[in-house]
């Protein structure tokens, strides 16, 4: 069956370059036109570039024209996207997509590869408790949590009590701060009556920086 | 370039419902229109091409129609697998423009948020920054307004919000809003409040604390 396997994504500084690859199998590569499409985090699909099956025609979106170059190597069944002078707004998941015969819609897609353009360096998070108090209690239910702040790049994983506590947990999508670093909160609602007896620990793992933090969250002692 | 405009941007529906998504082109594209379905973290999947031709393997409950500048995608009876984001795409011209997407979400019943406020930890204050977090838990619909007030003065530009995906158990959302200040600014003021407005609340709810008090 038709397969498009992508590689080459990663974190890159503004102004630098990156090359994405799209390795094709299951069809005669040299007969098909393949496009690049991207999707910024939380946004819609944006067409990026196309190269015709014979390499004669290349066409680019205005937003990347002059910076990105599409190419192909038929002997390796691979399509490339050379991205130069990268900008933070180029941060996206990039997909290669093959057309159906000659009609320019996308019948087959690669799995996508994330490109993050940022001047931030790899940094592990600081983990701060969101302590339960009378201000975070409502009708016998208390809320508590962890603030996972100032890390780069994505992702971090958060569990509670080493995965034993899952009910009532909300881990929010990360937000990108003006510093270029990410921050997120993970919260859990529990019975107020359990605060004195049950231990609550958030387990934070940031693989890119090899950071693991276990933070005990307890009511503030006044 | 041909612009594609999709509506609505979000559509709340229930299993069994008939739903219709509209796509308009800024100029005629004949029937050179495709529809895609995308689920979180996945690549888009082709549903329909040439406006009304069903892609092989796609269920017949998906119905495409239209030509020229007006197009619709109808799902005759919505199934659990159909909650996703849908995109139209014109392929009449070189720039293969997509619509901005329509998210089909589960229609829930109105539920007011439980509101909680968290002061910055002493640990964080030692680092020179103060984050005050307001949590809105388990509400529906998604539209909610959070306003920060410091000593009753409305804050703007110094907070960020994040919203969870819809919960598959109860169709609700949760939201966190974080007000970030320097330690010096934080210590200049006393009363920190977050005010929440939502359809499920008869009047806005305010949660607050006095800095330094338990």
């Amino acid at each position: 069956q038709v397969q498009l396997v992508q590689s080459g994504g990663g974190v890159v500084q503004p102004g630098r370059s990156l090359r994405l690859s799209c390795a094709a199998s299951g069809f005669t590569f040299s007969r098909y036109t393949i496009h690049w499409v991207r999707q910024a985090p939380g946004k819609g699909l944006e067409w990026v570039a196309v190269m015709s099956y014979n390499g004669n025609n290349k066409h680019y979106a205005d937003s990347v024209n002059g910076r990105f170059t599409i190419s192909r190597n038929d002997s390796k069944n691979t399509l490339y996207l050379n991205m130069n002078s990268l900008r933070p707004e180029d941060t996206a998941v990039y997909y290669c997509a093959r057309i159906r015969d000659t009609a320019m819609f996308f019948a087959h897609w690669g799995q996508g590869t994330l490109v993050t353009v940022s001047s931030a360096s790899t940094k592990g998070p600081s983990v701060f408790p969101l302590a339960p108090s009378s201000k975070s209690t409502s009708g016998g239910t208390a809320a508590l949590g962890c603030l996972v702040k100032d890390y780069f790049p994505e992702p971090v994983t958060v569990s509670w009590n080493s995965g034993a506590l899952t009910s009532g947990v909300h881990t929010f999508p990360a937000v990108l701060q003006s510093s270029g670093l990410y921050s997120l909160s993970s919260v859990v609602t529990v019975p107020s009556s359990s605060l004195g007896t049950q231990t609550y620990i958030c387990n934070v793992n940031h693989k890119p920086s090899n950071t693991k933090v276990d933070k005990k969250v307890e009511p503030k002692s006044c | 370039d041909i612009q594609m405009t999709q509506s609505p941007s979000t559509l709340s529906a229930s299993v069994g419902d008939r739903v219709t998504i509209t796509c308009r082109a800024s100029q005629s594209i004949n029937t050179w229109l495709a529809w895609y379905q995308q689920k979180p973290g996945k690549a888009p999947k082709l549903l329909m091409y040439k406006a009304s031709s069903l892609e092989s393997g796609v269920p017949s409950r998906f119905i495409g129609s239209g030509s020229g500048t007006e197009f619709t995608l109808t799902i005759s009876s919505l199934q659990p697998d159909d909650f996703a984001t849908y995109y139209c795409q014109q392929y009449n011209s070189d720039s293969k423009m997509f619509g901005q997407g329509t998210k089909v979400e589960v229609k829930g019943t109105v539920a007011a948020p439980s509101v909680f406020i968290f002061p910055p930890s002493d640990e964080q204050l030692k680092s020179g920054t103060a984050s005050v977090v307001c949590l809105l838990n388990n509400f529906y619909p998604r539209e909610a307004k959070v306003q920060w007030k410091v000593d009753n003065a409305l804050q703007s530009g110094n907070s960020q919000e994040s919203v969870t995906e819809q919960d598959s158990k109860d169709s609700t959302y949760s939201l966190s809003s974080t007000l970030t200040l320097s330690k010096a600014d934080y210590e200049k003021h006393k009363v920190y409040a977050c005010e929440v407005t939502h359809q499920g609340l008869s009047s806005p709810v305010t949660k607050s604390f006095n800095r330094g008090e338990c």
Epitope: - | S14, V15, G16, D17, P80, F83, V106, S168, D170
Partner: nanobody, 113 residues
Framework: QVQLQDSGGGLVQAGGSLRLSCAAS????????VAWFRQTPGGKEREFVA?????????NYADSVKGRFTVSRDNVKNTVFLQMSTLKPEDTAVYYC?????WGQGTQVTVSS
């Protein structure tokens, strides 16, 4: 996830009746509109049968079952029912309930002529 348990299927003579149940594991079930779908042995996809809103005051039926099937719910017991009367051989199918983005596992109904 809300776990949905379909039950009540079986073998019945044409003209007979069956009552299907869809029980949910979670009390949050009551916020959902629930629908019944069916899939015939040769059918490529599941066909809409009936629908009931969260508090039971609105129902909707496929033309093929109108007047014969009745959908109801008991939010105390977290259960939705499909009362099937005057059954026909063409009603033979696996019946599934659905709520939100969740499916039941299906229950087989066979109508013998």
């Amino acid at each position: 996830q809300v776990q949905l348990q379909d039950s009540g299927g079986g073998l019945v003579q044409a003209g007979g009746s069956l009552r299907l149940s869809c029980a949910a594991s979670s009390r949050t079930f009551s916020v959902y509109t629930v629908a019944w779908f069916r899939q015939t042995p040769g059918g490529k996809e599941r066909e809409f049968v009936a629908q009931i809103n969260w508090n039971g005051d609105s129902t909707n039926y496929a033309d093929s079952v109108k007047g014969r099937f009745t959908v109801s719910r008991d939010n105390v017991k977290n259960t939705v029912f499909l009362q099937m009367s005057t059954l026909k051989p063409e009603d033979t199918a696996v019946y599934y309930c659905a709520a939100g983005s969740n499916w039941g596992q299906g229950t087989q109904v066979t109508v013998s002529s």
